[in-house]
């Protein structure tokens, strides 16, 4: 079974409705908003999580220089269209027939258009740069300890294999975590870096998506690591297509 059998809940996604109506009376959980069945033994896709979030009550809310093609999610929340596997559909539209193309993490990668806009494929985000600023501490964290603890966090909490944590950079108080995962590297059962980054982002904001699991308590050699700012950059396998007007704005 994929959910906690005894009390029929979804450990990895609290934005679900669960009931023992699966095969053989097993616990089955469905994401809010989409009603899609989710695998509670792993992370739920970001698309289904965003859809669930939009359906929930509204009160529930050496350093690397990002490449010129890096995307930041400036558009904020929207109610996405997800495919049958829970991935973002390449084309997203709002209720007023304004459409745009997104990448595999659901971030807009083209100018907005109308219903005639074509998005031929879902472009994969293969490199994510998580930029954190930590609160002041007595001294700087030891870089190798910080690196090891963050790799451990992504493996232990988000199931992301250490090979996908490409690097951890640190210049006090800024920490940068680089996640890399090409299409060819991602095997069956591997967590997507986009999903891991989203769970991490929500954890950092104190909005954990896990059911019953404690909030994020990140420590480096016993010293609490408290984050006060997060910025996430997304790099796609194919550069985004924006007009010059946006680039000079």
């Amino acid at each position: 079974h994929t959910a906690a059998q005894d009390n029929c809940t979804c450990p990895t996604n609290k934005m679900t409705v669960c009931s023992p109506d699966g095969p053989g009376g097993r616990c089955q959980c469905r994401a809010l908003g989409s009603g899609m069945a989710v695998d509670c033994s792993t992370l739920t896709s970001k698309c289904l999580l965003l859809k669930a979030r939009m359906s929930a009550p509204k009160n529930a809310r050496t350093l690397v220089r990002p490449s010129e093609h890096a995307l930041v999610d400036n558009d904020g929340l929207y109610d996405p269209d997800c495919d049958p596997e829970g991935r973002f559909k390449a084309r997203q539209c709002n209720q007023t027939s304004v459409c745009w193309c997104v990448n595999s993490v659901g971030v807009r990668r083209t100018d907005k258009g109308d219903l005639s806009l074509r998005c031929d494929e879902l472009v994969r985000t293969h490199h994510i740069l998580i930029d954190l600023r930590h609160r002041p501490t007595a001294g700087a964290f030891n870089h190798s300890d910080l690196d090891a603890e963050l790799r451990r966090l992504f493996r232990e909490r988000y199931r992301l294999h250490p090979k996908f944590v490409a690097a951890v950079h640190y210049e006090q108080p800024t920490i940068q975590i680089e996640l890399r995962q090409n299409t060819s590297q991602k095997a069956a059962g591997d967590v997507d870096i986009g999903d891991a980054a989203y769970y991490f982002e929500r954890d950092i904001k104190g909005e954990s998506l896990f059911q019953g699991r404690g909030g994020l308590d990140l420590r480096v050699r016993g010293e609490p690591l408290q984050v006060e700012r997060t910025l996430i950059y997304y790099l796609d396998e194919i550069p985004p297509k924006f007009s010059m007007k946006r680039l000079t704005a």
């Epitope: 450990p11 232990e156 909490r157 294999h161 591997d190």
Partner: antibody, heavy 120, light 107 residues
């Protein structure tokens, strides 16, 4: 001193069930990923299953998926392996093993093992 | 799944010899490789992790090398207590696999 002590092995008929236990001591059990590894008589080592520190993330080898269930009780410093629908090829010494702290899945400490024999 | 192939399956060498055991992965595993020693009738013991790093308490005559698909465990000067079966294991993916083992004996 790190100690891992397995129990629960024995003789069971094909199709039967068995529950193995592992009592851990000498380290902070609740912060380590744990695994079961088995070794058929006179054969090599085979990884069976992994469970992360808080029990949320679990992996199984293809050979036992759907039949075996790994679990843990951090309050009791214990690791378990529930084995159902046992087959003759499951006959082996089952080792309780600790994964490295930083969640790389190699095994830094091994228990003495408990023998499971599946035979009619 | 990634297959691990060790060679030779068995070998016999004299005390003081330099001994080399190889392990080949069916696909790239970077340096996500460990080596274990299992003495007759005993429990396996970690020797090497991350392909080249010596585990605590392991004598310096043991060393590991390699990256990608080809790896080597070397014993620089064989001692009588090194009689054992040696296993490699990858941890590059979620499906962990061991090599079939190399049995080392003293001539």
């Amino acid at each position: 001193e790190v100690q891992l002590v397995e129990s629960g092995g024995g003789l069971v008929q094909p199709g039967g069930s068995l529950r193995l236990s592992c009592a851990a001591s000498g380290f902070t059990f609740s912060t380590y990923t744990m695994s079961w590894v088995r070794q058929a008589p006179g054969k090599g080592l085979e990884w069976v299953a992994n469970i992360n520190s808080d029990g949320y993330n679990i992996y199984y080898s293809d050979s036992v998926k759907g039949r075996f269930t790994i679990s843990r009780d951090n309050a009791k410093n214990s690791l378990y392996l529930q084995m159902n629908s046992l087959r003759a090829e499951d006959t082996a010494v089952y080792y309780c093993v600790r994964c490295s702290y930083y969640s790389y899945d190699y095994f830094d400490y091994w228990g003495q093992g408990t023998l499971v024999t599946v035979s009619s | 799944d990634i297959q691990m192939t060790q060679s030779p399956s068995s070998l016999s060498a004299s005390v003081g010899d330099r001994v080399t055991i190889t392990c080949r992965a069916s696909e790239n595993i970077d340096n996500y490789l460990a080596w274990y020693q299992q003495k007759p009738g005993k429990v396996p013991k970690l020797l090497i992790y991350a392909a080249t790093n010596l585990a605590d308490g392991v004598p310096s005559r043991f060393s590991g090398s390699g990256s990608g698909t080809d790896f080597t465990l070397t014993i620089s000067s064989l001692q009588p207590e090194d009689v054992a079966t040696y296993y490699c294991q990858h941890y590059y993916s979620n499906q962990l696999t061991f090599g079939q083992g190399t049995k080392l004996e003293i001539k």
